[in-house]
């Protein structure tokens, strides 16, 4: 099966590489504008130049394109703990990312926050933190796990998910979530 | 065994408000990132809001920031959503999940759902 493809890849593919068609005239390809520019004008005729205007300030494009507007930079979220790792150019959006010992947790395909790794009080690293993973930590004895963070049995109740952590018998108690709350 | 049951949905005209409700049991509440997920119908599930254990942080989506006030009761085990001048792309069903942080999107457990129309 032959993928469905949309009108301007349709265009594009009568073309080689680097090049698209005209759109008002099928007969003309005209060079795509390198990166960090956009299409003002196209070319008049085969053979002749694309007019290609470098992104204004605040605005790129990162591959060739015939785009006739650069694209906005994106602007990292304070309110969600983001800070910007390298600035926006002409030709690569800002980058954004979390600061040293926190992780991201995404809420959304391009949407994250920034939480701050577990340090594993009362318990030992058994992974590392990492960009978009928290510590995972193991309890020392007479601690369990709650939310990645080791806690004292003695705040565990009767009939709560850390009952089977917090057994006198068990002498090691080691920390996993209870399967039923994941 | 955890049970998430949400209550409150309903056909609203748009511009009108409802509010969302979710009884947790089965696990120790207040220890937890509570929040709303939704699923459209045709579309992929989406965080809305979500709140961490002491109420003191909060998420919204961009979609719904300023119309829709996430808040919990502890005592109760109960997790709201308040939401008001609704749009007919609000139209969905509406899941209480337990959020699992890290790496993601992920929607953790959740509830059954409660539907939400927004229609004249």
């Known amino acids: 099966l032959v993928p469905h493809l949309g009108d301007r890849e349709k265009r594009d593919s009568v073309c080689p590489q680097g090049k698209y068609i005209h759109p008002q005239n099928n007969s003309i390809c005209c060079t795509k504008c390198h990166k960090g520019t956009y299409l003002y004008n196209d070319c008049p005729g085969p053979g002749q130049d694309t007019d290609c205007r470098e992104c204004e300030s605040g605005s790129f494009t990162a591959s060739e394109n015939h785009l006739r507007h650069c694209l906005s930079c994106s602007k990292c979220r304070k309110e969600m703990g983001q800070v910007e790792i390298s600035s926006c150019t002409v030709d690569r959006d800002t980058v954004c990312g979390c600061r040293k010992n926190q992780y991201r947790h995404y809420w959304s395909e391009n949407l994250f926050q920034c939480f701050n790794c577990s340090l594993c009080l009362n318990g030992t690293v058994h992974l590392s933190c990492q960009e978009k993973q928290n510590t995972v930590c193991t309890c020392h004895a007479g601690f369990f796990l709650r939310e990645n963070e080791c806690v004292s049995c003695s705040n565990c109740k009767k009939s709560l998910e850390c009952t089977k952590l917090c057994l006198p018998q068990i002498e090691n108690v080691k920390g996993t979530e209870d399967s039923g709350t994941t | 065994e955890v049970q998430l049951l949400e209550s409150g949905g309903g056909l609203v005209q748009p511009g009108g408000s409802l509010r969302l409700s979710c009884a947790a049991s089965?696990?120790?509440?207040?220890?937890?990132?509570m929040g709303w997920v939704r699923q459209a119908p045709g579309k992929g599930l989406e965080w809305v809001s979500a709140?961490?254990?002491?109420?003191?942080?909060?998420y919204y989506a961009d979609s719904v920031k300023g119309r829709f006030t996430i808040s919990r009761d502890n005592s109760k085990n109960t997790l709201y959503l308040q939401m008001n001048s609704l749009r007919a792309e609000d139209a969905a069903v509406y899941y209480c999940?337990?959020?699992?942080?890290?790496?993601?999107?992920?929607?953790?457990?959740r509830g059954q759902g409660t539907l939400v129309t927004v229609s004249s």
């Open positions: 709140v961490s254990g002491s109420g003191g942080s909060t």
């Open positions: 999940a337990k959020v699992k942080l890290g790496g993601g999107p992920n929607f953790g457990y």
């Open positions: 089965g696990l120790t509440f207040e220890w937890y990132w």
